[in-house]
């Protein structure tokens, strides 16, 4: 069930020095300050649970305020190997090396970690985002160029006494932030090596990590305002479901997205929203302070529990899935973008979901915990929730088995 007893020393309690160590906003990612090299070079690094490389800008780029200068580091070691990472849109490429890395507002340790020095990129860095690199916190299986490149967190755990666990509290502002406000704002917390009780309310509920590559989980049921979408649960996880702090939206497989939008439209039919709103193209606006949150439904995702035939649900509010956007042309209004979108690579529980919850990536016990975040945006009538247990049968059938293309698995 919720498993509130302490496991090992240092796993729980207060991590004051790490609280509020993240900045940013959901649309452009959350970043932590890190130092690389000797003497230390300070960089802001995007926290990304959807990838596994530690990669930093290492050459001038129009969108970077600063970058890693390897030639200035006495502890840099060249691995004499290149790395190329293409995305559906865009790419980055660079040179692999190792150097000393620490997190000023993290555990008081320094580790030698693999670093991809990005020398060329396209559609990777974001103008005005204020981060210069990415910290991939997922598993070695998805590291580039291959799984032999040890990810940062693995190096951290191996070289120190930091427990094999981290937790994230991403705090959506609930209102748009301009550039100066972002620089001054608190974006949340990354607690390395433990769980901080002050960052959540209620109990933590855990779902198994299905496979250690992405942080893959299994969704067993979806409800819109308590109404079951009634789809074969395999559809919810086609071809996988992952928890990804580096993605803005809640992304859903095509069929699930269409069913969810149909249901959200029906629930909010007192107003007629343009088709472009559901596509994420058009904003919708209301006179400042009059956003009718009540006309939008809550969305519940039921996740496989730790006990056989037991699940729990996480429920988000429109305050999470309607993302505030500042537009000078409509500045007298509160304007929002629909932050649920279609995916061809499975469900992605991005910042839209994570901003409602304190999320524990308990790698040691191969599970992910969810509790209601102490900083989530809500109103006086509804709040995000994590509730259970619920009885759900045949949950294993909800997982999709990606066909193996590896030649070693083919019959001869």
């Amino acid at each position: 069930e919720t498993d509130e007893e302490p496991e090992e020393p240092g796993r729980r309690g207060s991590f004051v020095e790490m609280v509020d160590n993240l900045r940013g906003k959901s649309g452009q990612g959350y970043y932590v300050e890190m130092t690389v090299g000797s003497p230390p070079q300070t960089l802001n690094i995007l926290v990304d649970t959807g990838s596994s490389n530690f990669a930093v800008g290492a050459a001038p780029h129009p969108f970077l305020h600063r970058y890693y200068q390897r030639q200035l580091s006495s502890t840099y070691r060249d691995l004499r190997k290149g790395v190329y990472v293409p995305y559906t849109q865009g790419k980055w490429e660079g040179e692999l090396g190792t150097d000393l890395v620490s997190i000023p507002h993290g555990p008081n340790v320094t580790v030698r970690a693999n670093i991809a020095a990005i020398t060329e990129s396209d559609k990777f860095f974001i103008n005005g985002s204020n981060w210069e690199g990415i910290l991939g916190l997922a598993y070695a299986e998805i590291a580039r160029p291959d799984d032999s490149l040890e990810p940062f967190f693995d190096s951290l755990v191996k070289q120190t006494h930091v427990p094999n666990l981290f937790s994230l509290q991403l705090c959506g502002a609930g209102f748009p932030l301009n550039q100066s406000e972002v620089l001054a704002s608190v974006g949340g917390s990354m607690i390395i090596g433990g769980i901080d009780h002050s960052l959540y309310t209620g109990s933590l509920w855990y779902t198994p990590i299905r496979r250690e590559w992405y942080y893959e989980v299994i969704i067993v049921r979806v409800e819109i305002n308590g109404q079951d979408l009634k789809m074969d649960c395999k559809e919810y996880n086609y071809d996988k479901s992952i928890v990804d702090s580096g993605t803005t939206n809640l992304r859903l497989p095509k069929k699930v997205f269409e069913a969810a939008v149909k249901s959200i439209k029906a629930a909010s039919s007192t107003e007629k929203f343009p088709d472009g709103f559901w596509l994420g193209e058009q904003l919708v606006c209301w006179q400042a302070g009059t956003t009718p949150w009540n006309i939008f439904p809550v969305i519940s995702l039921y996740l496989m529990g730790e006990v056989t035939n037991q699940s729990f649900r996480i429920t988000i509010l429109p305050q999470q899935y309607l993302r505030p956007v500042e537009d000078v042309a409509t500045s007298q209004d509160d304007c929002y973008k629909f932050a649920i979108s279609q995916s061809s690579t499975g469900t992605v529980m991005g910042a839209v979901i994570m901003e409602g919850f304190y999320v524990v990536f308990d790698r040691a016990r191969k599970r992910i915990g969810f509790a209601v975040s102490a900083c989530h945006v809500h109103d006086e009538f509804r709040t995000a929730a994590v509730e259970g247990p619920f009885v759900t049968l045949d949950m294993e059938d909800c997982g999709y088995n990606i066909p193996q293309t590896d030649e070693s698995t083919l019959m001869t």
């Epitope: 649309g27 103008n127 107003e271 007629k272 343009p274 058009q282 904003l283 000078v328 409509t330």
Partner: antibody
């Protein structure tokens, strides 16, 4: 200040193609879609299509699907429209516009003249 | 496609007058209508969104109203710089469509 800077006028021969550009500034480029529109004298404004700079997703007016191709270069915050197999019917003023609620920002216009 | 009809191509008015430009949608578009002003040889200038909301910086003599299929742009205390063309647009569904325009002229 939000600005959309369009490329200059084009004089092209029938059957040729042309690529118009629209450079955005003053806002986070990947946050808003860019649209392209056509205006011919006495025929009002026609919506050609749109592109999402964050992932290059495009949506076209069926009428222009075979005529226009939209692309984006985020490194320069520029959107492009390629018009192919030009005829006199394609002689028009073309605009890029940024989404928000409807089209709050417009480029300054590009005149395309198709003439032998 | 949704047809947006501005039945009057031209409207005569005088400086200081109040004038109403109308636009009719061929099907229900809710309040998802915008109005633009265009000086000949220039880009359209946005005036109204969501049928009745003024874009930032638009003078309050411009007022939008309507929902469903019938929409009106009212200009009170017409100024000489208002003697230009006005377009309505629906952004309720794709493809986005515009009215044919209404030109204000001096009586």
């Amino acid at each position: 200040e939000v600005q959309l800077q369009q490329s200059g006028p084009e004089l092209v021969k029938p059957g040729a193609s042309v690529k118009l550009s629209c450079k955005a500034s003053g806002y986070t480029f990947t946050n808003f879609w860019i649209h392209w529109l056509k205006q011919r004298p006495g025929q009002g404004l026609e919506w050609i299509g749109m592109i999402d700079p964050s992932d290059s997703y495009t949506k076209y007016n069926q009428k222009f699907k075979a005529k226009a191709t939209l692309t984006v270069d985020t490194s320069s915050s520029t959107t492009y429209m390629h018009l192919s197999s030009l005829t006199s019917e394609d002689s028009a003023v073309y605009y890029c516009a940024r989404s928000g609620v409807a089209f709050p920002y417009w480029g300054q216009r590009t005149l395309v003249t198709v003439s032998a | 496609d949704i047809l947006m009809t501005q039945s009057q191509k031209f409207m005569s008015t005088s400086v200081g007058d109040r004038v109403s430009v109308t636009c009719k949608a061929s099907q229900n578009v809710g309040r998802n209508v915008a109005w633009y002003q265009q000086i000949s040889g220039q880009s359209p200038k946005p005036l109204i969104y969501s049928a009745s909301h003024r874009y930032s910086g638009v003078p309050d003599r411009f007022t939008g109203s309507g929902s469903g299929t019938d929409f009106t742009l009212t200009i009170s205390n017409v100024q000489s710089e208002d003697l230009v063309e006005f377009f309505c647009q629906q952004y309720n569904s794709y493809p986005y469509t515009f009215g044919g325009g209404t030109k204000l002229e001096i009586k």
